[in-house]
Interface confidence: low
Amino acid sequence: VPGEAEQPAPELVEVEVGSTALLKCGLSQSQGNLSHVDWFSVHKEKRTLIFRVRQGQGQSEPGEYEQRLSLQDRGATLALTQVTPQDERIFLCQGKRPRSQEYRIQLRVYKAPEEPNIQVNPLGIPVNSKEPEEVATCVGRNGYPIPQVIWYKNGRPLKEEKNRVHIQSSQTVESSGLYTLQSILKAQLVKEDKDAQFYCELNYRLPSGNHMKESREVTVPVFYPTEKVWLEVEPVGMLKEGDRVEIRCLADGNPPPHFSISKQNPSTREAEEETTNDNGVLVLEPARKEHSGRYECQGLDLDTMISLLSEPQELLVNYVSDVRVSPAAPERQEGSSLTLTCEAESSQDLEFQWLREETGQVLERGPVLQLHDLKREAGGGYRCVASVPSIPGLNRTQLVNVAIFGPPWMAFKERKVWVKENMVLNLSCEASGHPRPTISWNVNGTASEQDQDPQRVLSTLNVLVTPELLETGVECTASNDLGKNTSILFLELVNLTTLTPDSNTTTGLSTSTASPHTRANSTSTERKLPEPESRG
């Protein structure tokens, strides 16, 4: 075209993919009449007429731009919609009158790439490799033009370094015209890189300026040889029988070697391999004193067959032996004295306590409990607790039952029971003594006995309420070789003015079930009488 060399540089119009480019024809009135303009696209130096303006009216030419062009700004501006990367070219407008002049516009197209996707080499990298190995791959999809990639390690940009760092980038053009960038970071890593954080950054331009997107941070598996193996015991601190103890082998290499844990046989002094779980952990559960001893760990590198041995570790499982109490089954008369002695062995200093079983009250701190002037109430359970004060929870106990010779002793002397005629009553009577008493009833019925403890017995009786029974009441008698004792249960008819028939309240210590003869059962609860009772 004549005079093209003198033409000024084209005006630059920048636009993002998918948006609308406004191509303003920059011809001045002197250069041409904007009501009579031809628009061309220039691709590979070939001009193609794409739009005509005649008397201010626009008309698209058939072809790739036919559907995307329209006239704006009273004919001075050509709008190109749905811009694609292929639209990055020169557009020119040519005025026909008074003489043929043209104005060129360079359209630049941009598209931000997607978030970079980083994939670490899942196979990992050995530290002793001869040349850089693939660390990670970074992919930035659908950007335009091609973004730049920068790799970072621990926040610092990585530069190409001969035989140490190599960055291999390639790109593909999608059918959309957008670029997908793939960058592979290759590096020689050292042991300290096992915790290193790698990421990639895409730098790209938009009409608004320069931008960047960062990938997530990744760490790469780094393989390095084991230099040291050691044992670790959990929990830390003093161990006791019953604990769950885990002995594990640890190594400073990756992958860790194949571990085996051995315990020194105290008699042969030979190391004997222990059975570990799938994770190579020796679990002692529950730990026993026999587990005490010297443990060591062997780490075998299955590639090199190099074996490393840990320093031995002495394991002490603290214990308290079975507790022995003497005398084991003491029997005493009322008013006498009794000395109870407790013995046990332990790996640590022991502390002894004597407790009353029924109340939990501490009676003595020490192995010897002296009981003087024994009363009947002193009969029952005494528990010796042997504990290691420096190891909370390490203790053993032994219960001894002290029997005080004496005649039966009744839980109650008298009791009132509210009843209805023709009901089946469930009555109970409790007595204690040594030897343990037996209980009999003064009426016919179904009786059963339960031993509550070595000196105490509970008897229950099911009986039908009759007029005769209401008259006589019910007696239970407890007897042993030393004597007998009686409790009386007074039966009283429920009065409608005092109680509703369904409430069936009774008084006394235990529970009575009162059921109407040939009717459904109902329960009556006995409550203790308010006035003091003799328990003779």
Partner: antibody, heavy 119, light 108 residues
Framework: QVQLVESGGGLVQPGGSLRLSCAAS????????MSWVRQAPGKGLEWVSA????????YYADSVKGRFTISRDNSKNTLYLQMNSLRAEDTAVYYC????????????WGQGTLVTVSS | SELTQDPAVSVALGQTVRITCQGD??????ASWYQQKPGQAPVLVVF???NRPSGIPDRFSGSSSGNTASLTITGAQAEDEADYYC????????????FGGGTKLTVL
């Protein structure tokens, strides 16, 4: 024989930071819990922090919780105490200490390093 | 949790002195006892029920009852003049530790 040598003490302004180190020798370092204990001038001993042999468990006195961090490097037989947000009342001789075999109490002490917090 | 010690105790040369330490934690744990001389690091003298590290004279002994631990020096020597500290785990059952306030022993 057991040796514990502290370093890193010195003068620091309130709000500042300091890192104490303790080089240990003469015993299997990784098998023992270690502690830091301090002693303000003319005052008694105050337990500061402890760490298990593996470094997996750490314990702190209420007075330093959130400000001090105990750590260890078993490969270097070294115990550390990172002290941040220092206050005047942190001024003391700081002792590195080794736990007894039983655990729960101390059997060997270093000679201490003086930390002075003053503007 | 706290361990309480008398601030100062004195003893005549060759006599017996008892230094006490009170605290809830002593119901569950034994106290360990440390001797500290001016300008020096503390030294363990008694631990556990009544154990002495090697090199500690047998005039030092320990005992415990309830929530009180005691350090007894039988036949105190001039070189025993020092500060004595008791030490125990915290009564909360955690791995926290605690020291007593210290007792200044003067040998007259």
């Amino acid at each position: 024989q057991v040796q514990l040598v502290e370093s890193g003490g010195g003068l620091v302004q309130p709000g500042g930071s300091l890192r104490l180190s303790c080089a240990a020798s003469g015993f299997t370092f990784s098998s023992y819990a270690m502690s830091w204990v301090r002693q303000a001038p003319g005052k008694g001993l105050e337990w500061v922090s402890a760490i298990s042999g593996s470094g997996g468990s750490t314990y702190y006195a209420d007075s330093v919780k959130g400000r001090f961090t105990i750590s260890r490097d078993n490969s270097k037989n070294t115990l550390y105490l990172q002290m941040n947000s220092l206050r005047a009342e942190d001024t003391a001789v700081y002792y590195c200490a080794k736990d007894h075999d039983y655990g729960g109490f101390i059997d060997y002490w270093g000679q201490g390093t003086l930390v002075t917090v003053s503007s | 949790s706290e361990l309480t010690q008398d601030p100062a105790v004195s003893v005549a040369l060759g006599q017996t002195v008892r230094i006490t330490c009170q605290g809830d934690s002593l119901r569950s744990y034994y106290a360990s006892w440390y001797q500290q001389k001016p300008g020096q690091a503390p030294v363990l003298v008694v631990f556990g029920k009544n154990n002495r590290p090697s090199g500690i004279p047998d005039r030092f002994s320990g005992s415990s009852s309830g929530n009180t631990a005691s350090l007894t020096i039988t036949g105190a020597q001039a070189e025993d003049e020092a500060d004595y500290y008791c030490h125990s785990r915290d009564s909360s059952g955690t791995h926290l530790r605690v020291f007593g306030g210290g007792t200044k022993l003067t040998v007259l």
